[in-house]
């Protein structure tokens, strides 16, 4: 008997084989299958050639299927949606020849370190591209050239240190751009061109407020109604613009849009300061002693924002008017955590020392690099119920300067991954993340015996984002008990990776339990969580932050 559930949605045959323990395609798939769910199966590798007989296939969902390899070697002429999120893919094959009708590609939360320039060649109908939560450091300049119809682009929570000039050129339909949670210090002049971008997310980057940032500062002023702070479980169009969320890492932590670069050469001095042919440089911003310009607010009729993968609530680097609890966001489960000493130098991205060598003095201008471990770090399997470490003693915290509160995770009022009804776990439009079965026991978060002092945050937090270009110290020992370090900032200034002036020390501070495991909104809503591999707290990158 066929083990998958068959139904019909909007005239399409939908086959749900989620979480059936499948290591390969099940026999007996209906030939008229249009929507195929294969999520949460230990598939390991997958080839589209196996689906050749399914001539009507329009959606293929392979979320969290332990994929290490994806072969796109069979033509699927009607496939519109491909979801390979939450897997272990290190690269994406070229897709256009086999999947010419693709409109939505979700490869979020994989291990992509680079994309080849031709990955998207032939995908002329692509509307939505989700690459959140990978390890991308750079992007091919012409990556998006074939995708002129692109509307939503999510590059959040990667390791991008730069954006190629002209990267968005020709993307006249683009309405939503997620770039939060990267290692970006500036954007190239003219990067946004004349795009009408109603929804842009830029927080959580170490924006370096110097003369090169003036283009971004001006763009932010002119598009202040289009810049948002990612809020858990809230669609972009339902949130309030927050241009202040984009902040200087090195210049008093001020919002980038207020930075005026008083010492920078002006166009009259021969410097290249023009901004897309704007010419009035004489108006004043309130409270800022520098020239500004009129506000040009752009709107678009495209207002839908993708909500399959939830963004993180706080900017990674600094949040306006609040002290920030900087939690090491990508911690390996090790017996001891390495911490940097308190003698700190300039706050800049730095080269990551190899774990086997003593730390060296790192120059502030160095481009961040993340060495691969000599042996692969041990990670938890995706099917493992996430672990919440028990505190061994009341958590040690540093005293904040603002009123302390203990943040709690927020559960969204609705299950956001199901925009279209009657399709749970079936097919909302245009794509959905299939639901996850409940674990036998819901992971609980132990409460500390004494309430930890935590800096005030505006709203309950979610899984903390990486707080800067992380210095990755890969452990060479097998990970064991999860003790984690919580570091609190006492100043409003961003705490980035410091210049090391003395060797690292080792200590064993337990983490505040209520911050240990904060699943994403769609997980909270289901009362379950994804594999610990997908949570930043259990990611094999260690990032240490200390107060100045």
């Amino acid at each position: 008997e066929f083990i998958c559930e068959v139904s019909k949605v909007t005239s399409q045959v939908e086959v749900n084989c989620d979480n059936k323990g499948l290591k390969a395609l099940p026999p007996g798939l209906p030939g008229d299958t249009a929507i195929l769910h294969l999520a949460e199966n230990p598939l390991g590798a997958f080839s589209t050639a196996l689906l050749g007989p399914l001539t009507r296939l329009a959606q293929l969902h392979l979320r969290q299927s332990q994929l290490t390899q994806l072969q796109v070697d069979g033509m699927l002429p009607r496939l519109e949606t491909l979801d390979v999120s939450h897997n272990r893919l290190k690269s994406l094959p070229s897709l256009g020849r086999a999947l010419p009708a693709l409109t939505t590609l979700d490869a979020s939360f994989n291990e992509l370190v680079a994309l080849s320039p031709g990955t998207l060649d032939g995908l002329s109908h692509l509307h939505e591209l989700y690459l959140r939560g990978n390890k991308l450091k750079t992007l091919p300049p012409r990556l998006l050239a074939p995708t002129a119809q692109l509307r939503k682009l999510n590059l959040a929570d990667n390791r991008l240190t730069e954006l190629p000039p002209g990267f968005l050129e020709g993307l006249g339909e683009l309405d939503t751009l997620y770039l939060q949670g990267n290692w970006l210090r500036t954007v190239p002049k003219g990067f946004f061109g004349d795009l009408l971008l109603p929804f842009t997310f830029l927080h959580g980057n170490p924006w370096s407020c110097d003369c090169e940032i003036l283009y971004l500062a001006r763009w932010l002023r002119d598009n202040s109604n289009n810049v948002y702070l990612w809020k858990e479980g809230v669609e972009a169009k339902a949130t309030t613009p927050n241009v202040d969320s984009v902040r200087c890492v090195n210049w008093k932590n001020v919002p980038v849009h207020t930075y005026q670069g008083k010492d920078c050469p002006s166009p009259m001095d021969g410097g290249d300061m023009d901004y897309d042919n704007y010419d009035d440089e004489d108006e004043k911003l309130p409270g800022v002693e520098a020239p500004a310009t009129r506000a040009v607010v752009s709107f678009s009729t495209h207002t839908k924002a993708h909500t399959t993968h939830w963004g993180l609530l706080y900017p990674t680097f600094a949040y306006p008017d609040h002290q920030m609890a900087y939690l090491s966001s990508t911690l390996e489960l090790t017996e001891k955590q390495t911490m940097f000493p308190s003698t700190l130098g300039p706050i800049m991205p730095t080269t990551t020392p190899e774990p086997t060598t003593p730390p060296t003095t790192l120059e502030p201008t160095t481009t961040p690099t993340t060495p691969e471990p000599t042996t692969p770090p041990t990670t938890l399997e995706p099917t493992t119920t996430p672990i919440t470490p028990e505190p061994t003693m009341p958590p040690t915290t540093l005293e904040p300067t603002t009123t302390p509160i203990t943040p709690e995770p927020t559960t969204p009022s609705t299950t956001p991954t199901t925009p279209q009804p009657a399709t749970t776990p079936t097919t909302p439009q245009p794509a959905t993340t299939p639901t996850t079965p409940q674990p036998a026991t819901t992971p609980t978060t132990p409460q500390p015996t004494t309430t930890p002092t935590i800096p005030e945050l505006p709203t309950p937090p979610t899984t903390p984002e990486p707080t800067m270009p992380p210095t990755t110290l890969e452990p060479t020992t097998t990970p064991t008990s999860p003790t984690t370090t919580l570091i609190l900032s006492e100043s409003n200034t961003f705490l980035g990776i410091p210049e090391l002036t003395s060797p690292c020390t080792t200590s064993e501070y337990p983490i505040v339990p209520s911050l240990v495991h904060l699943p994403e909104a769609h997980e909270v809503a289901r009362g379950t969580s994804d594999s610990s591999r997908n949570h930043r707290l259990f990611n094999p990158d260690l990032c240490c932050l200390l107060p100045l």
């Epitope: 019909k8 949605v9 909007t10 030939g31 245009p430």
Partner: antibody, heavy 118, light 113 residues
Framework: QVQLVESGGGLVKPGGSLRLSCAAS????????MSWIRQAPGKGLEWVSS???????YYPDSVLGRFTISRDNAKNSLYLQMNSLRAEDTAVYYC????????????WGQGTLVTVSS | DIVMTQSPLSLPVTPGEPASISCKSS????????????LAWYLQKPGQSPQLLIY???TRESGVPDRFSGSGSGTDFTLKISRVEAEDVGVYYC?????????FGQGTKVEIK
């Protein structure tokens, strides 16, 4: 013109089995999805099962595992094998045609009465 | 499952007068990809099988008089008869054809006053 004629209804004891048939004519049977819909005495309509033109069956939870829909395109016939019958399965069973891959029912048969009683 | 709720359950009408039946779904029947609402209306005349009147909310089946019209979107739908005739009596059912299991309303019995 399109005609659908059901047969095979009757009286059966709880736990018993019955096989309904629907003879189709007046259209290219193999090109259409077909369904069974029932109506308990004095009550409303309830969908029982469907089968696509490609032969893919699907069911509501209320009959899943007990009823099996099938078709024989060579004989222009639709079938419903009903096992483990219960008193609440008592109803007039209609055979209905769907247009293409859509799921509204543009032609209905006259129905056959199934009574499950001890 | 999507629950369909009709009102009123009984509708006495006067020939020549208009009539209106409401149908509400527990979830939206709008497919955002094609902007179609997946709702159909049937009439079951006394002693007969149901017959299709309208599908996709407002598309009349061939042979159905133009005094029947359907409207609505999302979760709220209406069937209107502009001028009721004696032959229009019977039970009217709405049905969602958005996602299986296909579900029907309880029915609205239209009878002449």
């Amino acid at each position: 013109q399109v005609q659908l004629v059901e047969s095979g209804g009757g009286l059966v004891k709880p736990g018993g089995s019955l096989r309904l048939s629907c003879a189709a004519s007046g259209f290219t049977f193999s090109s259409f999805a077909m369904s069974w819909i029932r109506q308990a005495p004095g009550k409303g309509l309830e969908w029982v099962s469907s089968i696509t033109s490609a032969g893919t069956p699907y069911y509501p939870d209320s009959v899943l595992g007990r009823f099996t829909i099938s078709r024989d395109n060579a004989k222009n016939s639709l079938y419903l094998q009903m096992n483990s019958l219960r008193a609440e399965d008592t109803a007039v069973y209609y055979c209905a045609r769907s247009r293409g891959y859509e799921d509204y029912f543009d032609y209905w048969g006259q129905g056959t009465l199934v009574t499950v009683s001890s | 499952d999507i629950v369909m709720t009709q009102s009123p359950l009984s509708l006495p009408v006067t020939p020549g007068e208009p009539a209106s039946i409401s149908c509400k779904s527990s979830q939206s029947l709008l497919n955002s990809r094609n902007q179609k609402n997946y709702l159909a209306w049937y009439l079951q005349k006394p002693g007969q099988s149901p017959q299709l009147l309208i599908y996709f909310t407002s598309t009349r089946e061939s042979g159905v008089p133009d005094r029947f019209s359907g409207s609505g979107s999302g979760t709220d739908f209406t069937l209107k008869i502009s001028r009721v005739e004696a032959e229009d009596v019977g039970v009217y059912y709405c049905q969602q054809h958005y996602s299986s299991p296909w579900t029907f309303g309880q029915g609205t019995k239209v009878e002449i006053k």
